[in-house]
């Protein structure tokens, strides 16, 4: 799903207050609900009729450093006989998410939000039929 | 997918540098890749064999203010005849994501990262069989 544009209003102080100095804001250390965990049924990526593989990207200057991307294994979906059926299609499910980018020059460290597009998994759909003129 | 614990090392300055004052850091205004957009096939939530509905939650002190959650419509999956087949199951695909929480007292505004669990969509799986003792 989409993350709307900031429009720079969310991070601004109220109009009656002095502006933020140097175009930066105060980010408190620590993460709210840090212990919250995904509780998905196990191994759904291989049990799905639209199975997928995972690729991990790693960047030490990003939080989280590890971002996992899914790739659908097939064009079609897997039928009851375990065969690929291309009358149906495996399609990626995408999500816009935020990460934090760390920028440092010596002891001066600052952070910036970054929008990342994550493919979370795949689902099996009826393809849309188009008649090309 | 999981976001690892901060371990409070990512947001710390190098050991040789003076510590961060008052437990806060500098967050630069603006979002990297802000114009990046999801490009999923249209209406996959209703064309899927494991269809889902969306619910929108809104919080003006969160960025993004709008968080969309998916709920699978059925326990089973929709077969070629358009009927629910519970020999297969619709299961949610979840993703841990970051949002920014705004906290203000008068003109003093600070921000904190918050972890949110988002159900992004659903996929059709073969259920795991358990024999209860």
């Amino acid at each position: 799903r989409k993350i709307p544009k900031v429009g720079h209003t969310f991070f601004q102080k109220p109009e009656s207050c002095p502006p933020v100095p140097g175009g930066s804001m105060k980010l408190d250390i620590g993460i709210i609900n840090e212990n919250q965990r995904v509780s998905m049924s196990r191994n759904i990526e291989s049990r799905s009729t639209s199975p997928w593989n995972y690729t991990v990207t790693w960047d030490p200057n990003r939080y989280p450093s590890e971002v996992v991307q899914a790739q659908c294994r097939n064009l079609g979906c897997i039928n009851a006989q375990g065969k690929e059926d291309i009358s149906m299609n495996s399609v990626p499910i995408q999500q816009e998410t935020l990460v934090v980018r760390r920028k440092h020059q010596g002891c001066s460290v600052s952070f910036q939000l970054e929008k990342v597009l994550v493919t979370v998994g795949c689902t099996c759909v009826t393809p849309v039929i188009h008649h090309v003129q | 997918r999981k976001i690892p614990k901060v371990g409070h090392t990512f947001f710390q300055k190098p050991e040789s540098c003076p510590p961060v004052p008052g437990g806060s850091m500098k967050l630069d205004i603006g979002i990297i890749n802000e114009n990046q957009r999801v490009s999923m096939s249209r209406n996959i939530e209703s064309r899927s064999t494991s269809p889902w509905n969306y619910t929108v939650t809104w919080d003006p002190n969160r960025y993004p203010s709008e968080v969309v959650q998916a709920q699978c419509r059925n326990l089973g999956c929709i077969n070629a005849q358009g009927k629910e087949d519970i020999s297969m199951n619709s299961v949610p695909i979840q993703q841990e994501t970051l949002v920014v929480r705004r906290k203000h007292q008068g003109c003093s505004v600070s921000f904190q990262l918050e972890k949110v669990l988002v159900t992004v969509g659903c996929t059709c799986v073969t259920p795991v069989i358990h024999h209860v003792q």
Partner: nanobody, 115 residues
Framework: EVQLVESGGGLVQAGGSLRLSCAAS????????MGWYRAAPGKQRELVAI???????NYADSVKGRFTISRDSAKNAVYLQMNSLKPEDTAVYYC?????????WGQGTQVTVSS
């Protein structure tokens, strides 16, 4: 972890009635199905009756009009009222509980119908 508690089986004469019950605990989901399957000696396990999300029901043709499935969502329990029992209904009856991605089978309760 899911627990299933089955009860109500026993020995009954042909034409008699029994009521099976099964309560699930441990993991509760908005979407689920509960019901009963049975396995007669030397035969495959077959559907008796199930109820999906507390609403739609599905019965084996052989029990339609004689057996009634119902559930108490508050107790996460399912009941099978079996009337006009026949010797061919003799089997081990297994509670079935399906939550998204996982199916749980109970240990079974014996139903014996004597002629």
């Amino acid at each position: 972890e899911v627990q299933l508690v089955e009860s109500g089986g026993g020995l009954v004469q042909a034409g008699g009635s029994l009521r099976l019950s099964c309560a699930a605990s441990g993991v509760i989901f908005r979407l689920n199905a509960m019901g009963w399957y049975r396995a007669a000696p030397g035969k495959q396990r077959e559907l008796v009756a199930i109820i999906v999300n507390g609403g739609s029901t599905n019965y084996a043709d052989s029990v339609k009009g004689r057996f009634t499935i119902s559930r108490d969502s508050a107790k996460n329990a399912v009941y099978l009222q079996m009337n006009s029992l026949k010797p061919e209904d003799t089997a081990v009856y297994y509670c079935y509980y399906n939550i998204p991605g996982d199916v749980y089978w109970g240990q079974g309760t014996q139903v014996t119908v004597s002629s």
